[in-house]
Each structure stands twice: as structure tokens, then as C-alpha cells.
Amino acid sequence: DSSKWVFEHPETLYAWEGACVWIPCTYRALDGDLESFILFHNPEYNKNTSKFDGTRLYESTKDGKVPSEQKRVQFLGDKNKNCTLSIHPVHLNDSGQLGLRMESKTEKWMERIHLNVSERPFPPHIQLPPEIQESQEVTLTCLLNFSCYGYPIQLQWLLEGVPMRQAAVTSTSLTIKSVFTRSELKFSPQWSHHGKIVTCQLQDADGKFLSNDTVQLNVKHTPKLEIKVTPSDAIVREGDSVTMTCEVSSSNPEYTTVSWLKDGTSLKKQNTFTLNLREVTKDQSGKYCCQVSNDVGPGRSEEVFLQVQYAPEPSTVQILHSPAVEGSQVEFLCMSLANPLPTNYTWYHNGKEMQGRTEEKVHIPKILPWHAGTYSCVAENILGTGQRGPGAELDVQYPPKKVTTVIQNPMPIREGDTVTLSCNYNSSNPSVTRYEWKPHGAWEEPSLGVLKIQNVGWDNTTIACAACNSWCSWASPVALNVQYAPRDVRVRKIKPLSEIHSGNSVSLQCDFSSSHPKEVQFFWEKNGRLLGKESQLNFDSISPEDAGSYSCWVNNSIGQTASKAWTLEVLYAPRRLRVSMSPGDQVMEGKSATLTCESDANPPVSHYTWFDWNNQSLPYHSQKLRLEPVKVQHSGAYWCQGTNSVGKGRSPLSTLTVYYSPETIGRR
């Protein structure tokens, strides 16, 4: 209806004696600004006067008259929008209807607001969710339809009279729609909270109690159980009996079914609150609990650990690690099921007790080949001694041991022989798979670990072999000690240091580089003739006749070796000179005569000189002296002299006779 003023405010406001009331209010007048405002208490319209009768709590007029009540009641509004009011303090007799008489220039309006003031502070109201389940977070709400700026209050939560630890969130509303104070508490109830009293307490600013509301919690939860066992420590020996009892300490709603579990698995045909185990075996050791269900779900008791004690079972040995490499560390672990755990162990190696080893683990810091074998153990506890299990095998791997190179041939070995060697070893793990030889050669390996050297060389000194598995082990080199005839035999001149001159003392040495065996004999020969059996051949005074081709031989028990032929050269001055004449020593004049100076010299004659019967040197220096034509006056005795680097030699006289030709005789 467009003829109405528009107001917004809470329909009813609540307060109590001595508190205050704050009335949030807005309005919109039909025309213009507010000119007059009167607050009535329980107004009644008087038809006769066409005015409202009632107690005037507040009056605001143009002339500004204000009644004494003005101090208690305040109009906090304005002339066009806000009509908020405050009454402080509020009294019991303020209950009823408040009338807001509003007048503008041309229009009037009476707006009614209900005020409910109680004698004492009224209680807040606790709101709970429809269902509360254990461990599920819920929000508890405490609502009080009161809030006033001038009268601070607080809401506190209590559980069984004790303040709750959880932090509550308090909110207030002072709006045209609603006026309230609300406290919200987030809370995860446990089953133990079932049936407990929760209180929301209204307090003034000083914490003084004003009022409260209480509720009883109805926490839905799975059955809560207690398990009892006889004997109480749940430790028994095989053959003993055990009784377990399940007691329900709480269930909401009531429980429906009962069952028993061992190690999380349900035990068949066990649906009563008592579990009887007769003549228990070690297999019955484990964690037992009872399970009781209701509509919320199953509840489980705490677990009872039933220990059925027994002597150790046959043991097994675990080796870390096998196979083991020699020098590495190895750990042995004795494993035996027993209850209580074994307190003592006895260890065996290849059936023989290992002294001092009484613990679950045995540690060998450096494994050696003889540590290989079977390791077993026996475990012991208070109930007895177990049996020795089958044991575990320790395989110790190591390089081949005590490797030797062995010569198979009869000794001695001679150059050119075929030599067979074998590579032997004492032990190896894993097995030897290959062999190596040093030095390398184009040799034959007819079978694994055997080396054949065809036509063995004189210089094959030592051979070493290695036997290899995952590792190679080298033997010490073995000397072949090959025997051979003397080598590199040669003739060497010891003296003189320079060339040999006739008459010199001369020594020749028969040299060789090596011989095995070392014992040797020497032989000198010239032109097939044996000259001596020493390493040296000596000439006290060499003559040209000693020159020639010499050889020396060196022999040992294996054979003999000759040197290359060595030429002995003797240097001497020209000798045995003679003059020979051609065509003869008697030549007819006019013919040709050739005189030749013949000699024996080393080096050969380099220079000739010719002399006549008067020892007069002739102007000719070649070996031949040619007279052509020859004259009778050429007749006479001639001689020649030969010269080389060593010296000179002269010939005896040779006479040339030149006779007249028949023509000359005829002319005479």
C-alpha cells in the first residue's frame, strides 16, 4: 500500500530488569523530513481526540521540549532514515508495546515494536545437531536473543561443570533483522562424553553468572570393550590353557554381535564373551582381541599378545655373503624360532664347535680359504636347546694358489729342441679356466695349461705362467737354461794395433759372444792345416809367408762354430827384385828391348827407379823400361829399385847385350 510509511526493525526485543535494550530501526517517510517524534509505552488511540494516549517515554518536538525520561531513553535516529532507539537501563514495566509516533509536514504514522523485559536474565538456548557420533566434529550453538551496546555479556561453555578447552567463536547481531548473541563451539566428542552434561552459561562482563542452559550429550559410539586374560601376563607354555573374557564397558546403541580375532583374522565359531584355548600350541601365539558390533559399527578391544613359549626350533644359518672373496668380511646369522628368544648359541664349522662363539651373529673380518665349509648353529633358551639344522655352505673364492711353471723335458734343453712346459697350481676357487704365459710368443698350447715351444731358441731364457680363474696368479719365472753351440765366433787381431809389418810380433784372438755350456775348445787353421788350440794365435816375428786366410773354431759339448775366414796381410818393402829382359838379354840393334823390374812387395811398388852400369839413374820410373830402337851402346848392366810405403829394394845387375845387325856388319 503506497500510503504507508516503511519501517524495518525486529518485531520483538528481549531484555531483563536492569539491562538495556537497543532497538535498531530504519524508516522512510511518505513526504519530507520528520518534524515530530514521540515514543509511547502501550499507546492507545483515542477516537474522541483523534490522538494517541499512553506514557510518553521520549518526545522530540519543534520547540525542543524533552521530558525527564529522555535521560533513560535515547532516540539515536535522524529526520529521514534512522529511527534507532536505546533504553538504558530497561525495567520490568517497560514490557509491552513501544509506539513510535512519527509526524512530517503532512503525514503521521504510529509504528509498534514489542518489548519483552523479564524479571531475571532469561536463559540462552543450546542447539545440537540431530545426531552426534564419536570422533566426528560437531558444532554446538548457544543462542541468546539479546544484545545491547551498553550491557556487555559473555557466553561460556562447560562440560560437567568444567570449562571446555576448545575455543568458542562468539558473534553478536544488532540489525534491523535480528538481535542476538551467539556462541559456536566446534567439538569432537568421544564415546566417554556420552551422557555428559553440557552447559552454556550467560555471564555479565565481570563473569558473574546470569543464567544458563544445559543439555545431556547423546554420543553414538561403537561398543567399548575390555579384555581380560588368565594368566594375566598372557605368557604360557605349550600344553597350557588360556581363558580370555570380553567385557562391554559402553555401547550406544546396544550391541548386537560378538566375535574373536587372532592377528586380525576372525576365529570361527567363537561368538561368546569368553574364549577358551585348551592345550595351546606355539602356532596359537599371536595378538587376540574381541569385536562387538552395534548399529554404529564394530568395536574392538585392545590386543592381548599371547606368547606360547617353546624351546628353539632347528636352526638355519644365513651367510652374508656367499660366495665370499678371500680377504673380505663375512657375517653368519643363526636363525631359530623360539620363545623366549634364544639367550645362547653354539656354532659349528664342518661339524666342529667354534670356540667362544655364543652370539646370534658370527663375524669373520678377513675370510681365508680354509674358512670354507658348512656352518651350523644351535640355539638355546630357558626351555631348552634346539637342534642343529642343516647348516649353510660358505664358498670362499680365491686366486689360484702356489702356481709353478714346470719343464717337462729331460734336461738339458738344447737349442732347436721342442720344449714342453706345464702350469701347475695347488688349489683354486673357482676352477682355473685359462692360462697366460710370459713372454708372449707364437707358441702352441696343445692343451689347457701346457705350452709347447718348437725349435727353442738359444736366447729363450725364462718363461712364467699364470693360472687364471676370476683372478690371475703368476708363477715365478723358470729358467729354460737352453744349451747351444758357441755363437758369433770371429777372428780379432789383438796386436799390433796398426797394420802388420814383416817382422812384427802378431797376436790373433778367437772371440765368441756366448756359449752354453761355458766350457769350450779352440782350433786355428790356415788352408785346412791345424795351427793351434788356444784362444790366441801368436807370431813372434811375422813373415810375408804367414799371410793368408785364417779361421778359428770354437766348440763345446753341443757343437762347434767356425769363424768367417780372416785374411792376414803382412806389409813388407819390395824384395826379390830382378830385371827381366824381353825378348831376351841379347838383342840385335835396331830392334826393341823391354826391361821389366819384377818384385815382391806389399803393398805393391809405387815407384821404380832404373840405374845403368855406372849406377847412373835413368829418366824412367815405370816398371818397364823400353829401348826402341836399341843401340849397341845400350849394351851394359842394368838394375832397378822399387819403392813402397814400407821401404826400398834393389835388384842385382842384369846385362843386356846389343849386337850389330848384318847390315851394319855388311857396311863394315
Epitope: G356, H363, I364, P365, L368, W370
Partner: antibody, heavy 117, light 106 residues
Framework: EVQLQESGPGLVKPSQTLSLTCTVS????????ISWIRQPPGKGLEWLGV???????NYNSALKSRVTISKDNSKSQVSLKLSSVTAADTAVYYC???????????WGQGTTVTVSS | EIVLTQSPATLSLSPGERATLSCRAS??????IAWYQQKPGQAPRLLIH???TRQTGIPARFSGSGSGRDYTLTISSLEPEDFAVYYC????????FGGGTKLEIK
């Protein structure tokens, strides 16, 4: 590097208790057994007893009533106690490590103990 | 308790000669025997363990053999530095030393 250091008083009075300590390094007492050996002047070697890796002990039967060997693995120390000593207990005392199936290859220099009043 | 008897008590030889030292156990010691060399003022030095295994760094002239109760240490060709006291040790059942053999220069 394996090292052994025997220490203790060089002079002990007759009837008193001889106490020696062996401090080891380079290995653990949980891996090696330790034996005590002695050598009187001009005489041979005599084994006194052993403490095994697990802490058990065995002693030379001739000395069993007088000898005690103990150890502290965390301190790497082994101790020897020989009670009611006489001049015959004068010797060089060695502590030596060994393990199952392996002879003693590390010997310290030993410590000389003289029993005299 | 195992008893070890070493023989001879003294052995007089010249450098280059072969030395044979014996050790006899009162019962089978399963090859668990070691040989030590000791020089005056020094700690014993391990030569051979497990009857015949030469310790690292020990010259090849030292060798060991034997089984059961009887064991031998052989020095193939004596060097001047080999003259010392030699002890055998059994470690098959606890530990026992032999009385020693003194190897002296003839």
C-alpha cells in the same frame, strides 16, 4: 692401521693384583678376539686367556683362579687382572688380536711388569 | 688342554744350510698351527699360519707342512738374519705355545 697399546704399572708388589689395559685402534672389539700372552725374561711365550667378541672368556687352566679379562667395546679397551702375584709373574705382557681360524699377526711392543717388594 | 712339544730345543747350523724344526701336538689340531720368529727385545713375528700359508712379506725360503699331530717348519737355505728363537702355536682349541727352538749359528 691396527695398533695395540698395553699400559699399566711397571712395578707391582708381591701378593697384590696386577692390572693392565690394552687400548686398540684400527679394528673393533666386536670383530676380533683378544688374547693376553706373557713372556718371562729368557723364557718362552705363555698364553694367559682370551676374551671373545661376544664377551665370553677362557683362561689358561694353570692360572684360572687368578686371572680375569674384561673389555669395554665402546672405549676399545681390554683389561687383564692377575691377583696374588709373585716374582714368577715378572714378564713382558702382550695383548694380541685374532679371530676364528686365524692366528695372531699383530703384536704390540708389550709392557714389562716387575713383581718386587 | 693341548700340549705342544718343540724339537730340538737348540739347533746349530751354518748359513746356507737347511733347517728343519718340529712341533708335535698332544692331539689332532686340524692344521691350525702357526709359526713365529722372535729376536731378542722384539715381539714375535708371524711367519706361517694354517700349517703352510706364508704370511705376507715372509721370504719363500720359509715353508710349513704337516697334519694331524705332527708339523714342521723348514728354512731351505739359512740366511744370517734367520738365527732366532722359533715358536709354534696351536689355535684349534684355545691357544697353546710350544716351548721354542733356538736356531743358532754353528
Amino acid at each position: 692401521e691396527v695398533q695395540l697399546q698395553e699400559s699399566g704399572p711397571g712395578l707391582v708388589k708381591p701378593s697384590q693384583t696386577l692390572s693392565l689395559t690394552c687400548t686398540v685402534s684400527g679394528f673393533s672389539l666386536t670383530s676380533y678376539d683378544i688374547s693376553w700372552i706373557r713372556q718371562p725374561p729368557g723364557k718362552g711365550l705363555e698364553w694367559l686367556g682370551v676374551i671373545w667378541t661376544g664377551g665370553g672368556t677362557n683362561y689358561n687352566s694353570a692360572l684360572k683362579s687368578r686371572v680375569t679379562i674384561s673389555k669395554d667395546n665402546s672405549k676399545s679397551q681390554v683389561s687383564l687382572k692377575l691377583s696374588s702375584v709373585t716374582a714368577a709373574d715378572t714378564a713382558v705382557y702382550y695383548c694380541v688380536p685374532h679371530y676364528y681360524g686365524y692366528a695372531m699377526d699383530y703384536w704390540g711392543q708389550g709392557t714389562t711388569v716387575t713383581v718386587s717388594s | 688342554e693341548i700340549v705342544l712339544t718343540q724339537s730340538p730345543a737348540t739347533l746349530s747350523l751354518s748359513p746356507g744350510e737347511r733347517a728343519t724344526l718340529s712341533c708335535r701336538a698332544s692331539q689332532d689340531i686340524n692344521k691350525y698351527i702357526a709359526w713365529y720368529q722372535q729376536k731378542p727385545g722384539q715381539a714375535p713375528r708371524l711367519l706361517i699360519h694354517y700349517t703352510s700359508t706364508r704370511q705376507t712379506g715372509i721370504p719363500a725360503r720359509f715353508s710349513g707342512s704337516g697334519s694331524g699331530r705332527d708339523y714342521t717348519l723348514t728354512i731351505s737355505s739359512l740366511e744370517p738374519e734367520d738365527f732366532a728363537v722359533y715358536y709354534c702355536l696351536q689355535y684349534d682349541n684355545l691357544l697353546t705355545f710350544g716351548g721354542g727352538t733356538k736356531l743358532e749359528i754353528k
